[in-house]
């Protein structure tokens, strides 16, 4: 191509040093942060994902920064403010960490946030077969419907001993969410 | 996540007693309740008993004939297994596990969140 | 007590093949009989609930039959990651105490060739 050193190639502050092979008459040293035969590419370093938690990546050019999500700080946002380090649940709920949040795990009666509002434990429905669900002061207590017995109705009273129970509403797994 | 974790396992004389702790996180006990299930070495399953912390029951397993004990504690967040008057036969690994009770008014009775297990060994 | 019984002990089968485990309840269990897979050093894993309801996350290659006092499990298009052993629990009502209790089968070793 005929092009060297005197023509200035190197773009970017690159420095220009003549080949030593006859077929490539100069190469270009390019500064930090940008790459190419002539320095003309930026080098994209927030490709390497620096930023945890779910930053966000800035290449200033001098530096990078990261731009922390909500409950997360440090350099590349590497410590979680959200864990459960001095974090109160109400009416003895527990906390539970995971994926950079944390939440209570309340106990029976009570929800919300910090398990400080009073829960209807009926509303989750552990009565089956259509049982009527009663919150006591000692636990729940289910009224069986016709035809059910046992703690939360779950057993049939088949006096002909018929083997079949309703089934299970498709797709409904132990743990999905509520219907 | 839902998760148990069984601890308090170990080495125990034979008529000693030990109590074995289930830290639980990440479910409501409207629905679930937690089961203690027993596995000797190179054996089968052996259910031991449940809590069902809503109702305020417990059952057992006829076999345990009152040497062991399931509580509840601190807002039923730990569980717990009084085991009394061991022998060798009770040398085994003790897991604690979730019970799929009654989910929106659908009755399950599967056992589907198992911890680790901790093991007891009853020898003089 | 209701006694859960599991045939065969064992079985062995090629990759690619199927094996049937049975288990058959001393009472009528309606349909209250749930399969776990265990592998040696593990804690067991629940594979189907309720009879034939696949837990999530487990291939649709197990599937779980029966009602009343006996049950089936069936494992199509063996893999060598199937060799575990299989107990079959059941939930009944124990009418001389008037409460619901557990019971496991005593197992079934699957071997894969």
């Known amino acids: 191509s005929g092009v060297t050193c005197a023509d200035g190639p190197c773009f970017n502050g690159g420095l220009c040093v003549g080949g030593a092979d006859p077929d490539s008459a100069y190469i270009c040293h390019c500064p930090p942060g940008f790459q190419g035969s002539n320095c003309e590419k930026r080098v994209d370093r927030c490709s390497l994902q620096p930023c945890r938690n779910g930053g966000l990546c800035l290449d200033l050019g001098h530096a990078l920064r990261c731009r922390c999500r909500a409950g997360f700080a440090g350099p590349r946002c590497e410590h979680d403010l959200d864990d459960c380090a001095g974090r109160a649940c109400a009416n003895g709920g527990t906390c539970v960490e995971g994926g950079g949040a944390h939440r209570c795990s309340c106990a029976l009666g009570f929800g919300g946030r910090d398990c400080r509002e009073r829960a209807d434990p009926c509303a989750a429905r552990p009565c089956a077969h259509g049982g009527r669900c009663y919150a006591h002061f000692s636990g729940l207590v289910c009224a069986c419907a016709p035809g059910y017995m046992g703690a939360r109705c779950e057993f049939p009273v088949h006096p002909d001993g018929a083997s079949a129970l309703p089934a299970a509403p498709p797709g409904l797994r132990p743990g999905d969410p509520q219907r | 996540q839902e998760q148990l974790v069984e601890s308090g396992g170990g080495l125990v004389q034979p008529g000693g007693s030990l109590k074995l702790s289930c830290k639980v996180s990440?479910?409501?006990?409207?629905?679930?309740?937690v089961s203690w299930v027993r596995q000797a070495p190179g054996k089968g399953l052996e259910w031991i008993g449940y809590?069902?912390?809503?109702?305020?029951?417990?059952y057992y397993a006829s076999w345990v004939n009152g040497r062991f004990t399931i509580s509840s504690h601190n807002a039923q967040n730990t569980l717990y297994l009084q085991l009394n008057s061991l022998t060798a036969a009770d040398t085994a690994t003790y897991f604690c596990?979730?019970?799929?009770?009654?989910?929106?008014?659908?009755?399950?009775?599967?056992?589907?969140?198992w911890g680790p297990g901790t093991l007891v060994t009853v020898s003089s | 007590d209701v006694v859960m019984t599991q045939t065969p002990a064992s079985v062995e089968a090629a990759v690619g093949g199927t094996v049937t485990i049975n288990c058959q309840a001393s009472?009528?269990?309606?349909?209250?009989l749930s399969w776990y897979q265990q592998k040696p050093g593990q804690p067991p894993k629940l594979l189907i609930y309720?009879?034939?309801t696949l837990a999530s996350g487990v291939p649709s290659r197990f599937k779980g039959s029966g009602s009343g006092t006996q049950f089936t499990l069936t494992i199509s298009d063996l893999e060598c990651a199937d060799a575990a052993t299989y107990y079959c629990?059941?939930?009944?009502?124990?009418?001389?105490?008037?409460?619901?209790?557990?019971?496991f089968g005593g197992g079934t070793e699957v071997v894969v060739k």
């Open positions: 990440g479910f409501d006990f409207s629905n679930y309740g």
């Open positions: 629990q059941s939930y009944y009502y124990s009418s001389g105490s008037s409460y619901g209790a557990f019971a």
């Open positions: 309720r009879t034939s």
């Open positions: 596990v979730r019970v799929a009770l009654v989910v929106a008014g659908v009755a399950y009775y599967g056992m589907d969140v």
């Open positions: 809590i069902d912390p809503a109702f305020g029951r417990t």
């Open positions: 009472q009528n269990i309606y349909s209250y």
